[in-house]
Interface confidence: low
Amino acid sequence: GMEVRWCATSDPEQHKCGNMSEAFREAGIQPSLLCVRGTSADHCVQLIAAQEADAITLDGGAIYEAGKEHGLKPVVGEVYDQEVGTSYYAVAVVRRSSHVTIDTLKGVKSCHTGINRTVGWNVPVGYLVESGRLSVMGCDVLKAVSDYFGGSCVPGAGETSYSESLCRLCRGDSSGEGVCDKSPLERYYDYSGAFRCLAEGAGDVAFVKHSTVLENTDGKTLPSWGQALLSQDFELLCRDGSRADVTEWRQCHLARVPAHAVVVRADTDGGLIFRLLNEGQRLFSHEGSSFQMFSSEAYGQKDLLFKDSTSELVPIATQTYEAWLGHEYLHAMKGLLCDPNRLPPYLRWCVLSTPEIQKCGDMAVAFRRQRLKPEIQCVSAKSPQHCMERIQAEQVDAVTLSGEDIYTAGKTYGLVPAAGEHYAPEDSSNSYYVVAVVRRDSSHAFTLDELRGKRSCHAGFGSPAGWDVPVGALIQRGFIRPKDCDVLTAVSEFFNASCVPVNNPKNYPSSLCALCVGDEQGRNKCVGNSQERYYGYRGAFRCLVENAGDVAFVRHTTVFDNTNGHNSEPWAAELRSEDYELLCPNGARAEVSQFAACNLAQIPPHAVMVRPDTNIFTVYGLLDKAQDLFGDDHNKNGFKMFDSSNYHGQDLLFKDATVRAVPVGEKTTYRGWLGLDYVAALEGMSSQQC
């Protein structure tokens, strides 16, 4: 007959489960409830996945693991005696008098409820990792946290390798016993203890529950340490960098923490499980009943099968672990869950040329010498597309790609960004803009709407800022109208003449090479490499400077890189940035410094792309630790990550312009990373490639 096999994780829980089974049987509740003994919640999840058990109640972190790794789904939720229903909130509390924000937590002293506790550890640490504020190398979260904060009290961290830092603020009991114990012996343990750690000035931030401050201030009946405390002297840190009153926890928190829930296999009828438990709670949740579902007192433990504070069980409508956990908690868990035993020992980097192989080999050696994890291995491929294929096929793990290639990697191969490049320090959005540069000329001034018949300079055919975006934008705006998808002819007819260097000039309209000049000897005209002096962003700007063209489509940094003494080549040495302007989409002209408001599109920086099952936080964690050692082009550690001059190449592994590798933050998909305008431009262009 039909039966539900509950998984118990301990002898007391098995005892209570047996009693529940008997009570249900006696009451005629169907289907039958049987009990299976597991050794832990993790083991029970495996038993359920293997169809050797059917159900267990789990906390949020375990629900995430069970859902993500084993396909289990939550079907029944616990509700507790509090106003927020099936959840509570994890908050970060600071003293009102301090100036700490979520963005300035590095180096501050932190108070935690306990190691691996939900609001005191899992949510804040996971959130800091997931948002890119805290980088973790080789899954060593404890080391990362101990390096990040300026000392902490994390009760239970005394047995770890980082107890010096993680237990530095702990004080034990009044006689100094039990320092850093995960028990009430440690005065800074649990919600009230972590808040006390903040209130007494030991720490600068406390990671606690939304109700903690209000329960421990304003003259509530409390131990002496809290009697004089006022809730108005504390504030919450919000995710957007602001702060808020402690009563504003619904709007200002790190994450909504889901209640515990009963999980089952995807093929199990959730309605059946709820009907079984609902019958049970109807009969066995009131005091004095022969069996009490929501009490564990009789077994000498707490929270057996269900949390003792459960007031009722409710059916879960959307039975997916993502929906139950909510995006805030889900994101935090993504940042936290990193199993060192499942971390591959190597990160296989895709390389595309001999110089790149050489630089990658040096990078692997340099990283290994510094004991950075995972170790780099270099695997060669024929092209970026070949890299994508090899990554999808799990033969390689990572490659740095440009915007267009990111689009292909995401759309066609399912890859995701793990880290990004960050270029100019003033470029706060970590990306650059496509701009149309013209000479400042009051007598012959023209606008973007008047480009027809002008002479144009482009970095090269297929170059993002030099071709794809400007041409895409002009097509989108209806200025260029390709017939039969023939973009090249349409562009050649739109401009009077152009220089658009190209690698394969077969069937290439001659006017697209008309302005090109080739090398010093006049050879290699219009070739798609630096032998053509008007090739690349610098070359396209030179084409404008030397009056070959009227407009140059370049990056927003190109003018600054080649004027005001920044480029000593003869053609650029005397140039001044004030002599150039930008054409804006609204028909105006603007100073070259106004690129953020006057551009054709924002192009994302290059990103490191990986398979979706790769832990992006370990990739960023490796790169972040590496750049501390090798990121500065003047470092003395034997390798320069963001410089290719030693290898007679340019932009090897990373663009040479990279200042830092940055976390992807919320831009965890190729579309998120690329941005809507840029994707639209690419899709506009690709719609013409018939």
Partner: antibody
Framework: EVQLQESGPSLVKPSQTLSLTCSVT??????GYWNWIRKFPGNKLEYM?????????YYNPSLKSRISITRDTSKNQAYLQLNFVTAEDTATYNC?????????????WGQGTSVTVSS | DFVMTQTPLSLPVSLGDQASISCRAS???????????LHWYLQKPGQSPKLLIY???NRFSGVPDRFSGSGSGTDFTLKISRVEAEDLGVYFC?????????FGGGTKLEIK
């Protein structure tokens, strides 16, 4: 219990397109990997490709230019299309599930459907 | 592709005997993560293939303990300690360490 059932025409003419359906019960097609394998006369098995829970596809490079695997989540079905078939494509076609629980071994298979390519 | 060679092609046995099937890979099946993704399947006459063993030696749920898998690197063995009538059919080994997954040519277990 998880069950997979392949269906489609048993006879396809050369140069035409072979289209098969894999209907899944007892599991959702939005979890795990759903694969197509074919068995040639004489027992040789060839892995053709998969569609994953997130809709990503992988195709055996030997078939890449001809194969397409799609799905309809509302019907809980996966589909195989093989273009420009020849007599060499005569085989029994199976769909199978792979999940993490068995480290992506194929834990459940359909009965298979026999397809002959002939004019 | 990675070639999987199974021997013997045909294995005549008496009921109650031990049977042993060998599978050899053209290259090591040890993944960079340390795991070896070598699996065994049985296809009984007129039935769909069934998973017996995954990752070299793990029995799939419901598979009798008379079936055992062993091996490492490139050489693997499936043993049936006491052959029963319901064990007859074609046994396949398969690897999924390397992409695409590949299969052995099959071993037909039949009654002497």
């Amino acid at each position: 219990e998880v069950q997979l059932q392949e269906s489609g025409p048993s006879l396809v003419k050369p140069s035409q397109t072979l289209s098969l359906t894999c209907s899944v019960t007892g599991d959702s097609i939005t979890s795990g990997y759903w694969n197509w394998i074919r068995k040639f006369p004489g027992n040789k098995l060839e892995y053709m490709g998969y569609i994953s829970d997130s809709g990503i596809t992988y195709y055996n490079p030997s078939l890449k230019s001809r194969i397409s695997i799609t799905r309809d989540t509302s019907k809980n079905q996966a589909y195989l299309q093989l273009n420009f078939v020849t007599a060499e494509d005569t085989a029994t076609y199976n769909c199978a599930r792979r999940t993490l629980a068995t480290y992506y071994a194929m834990d459940y298979w359909g009965q298979g459907t026999s397809v002959t390519v002939s004019s | 592709d990675f070639v999987m060679t199974q021997t013997p092609l045909s294995l005549p046995v008496s009921l109650g005997d031990q049977a042993s099937i060998s599978c050899r890979a053209s290259q090591s099946l040890v993944h960079s993560n340390g795991n070896t993704y070598l699996h065994w399947y049985l296809q009984k006459p007129g039935q769909s293939p069934k998973l017996l063993i995954y990752r070299v030696s793990n029995r799939f749920s419901g598979v009798p303990d008379r079936f055992s898998g062993s091996g490492s690197g490139t050489d693997f063995t499936l043993k049936i300690s006491r052959v029963e009538a319901e064990d007859l059919g074609v046994y396949f080994c398969s690897q999924s360490t390397h992409v695409p997954p590949t299969f052995g040519g099959g071993t037909k277990l039949e009654i002497k």
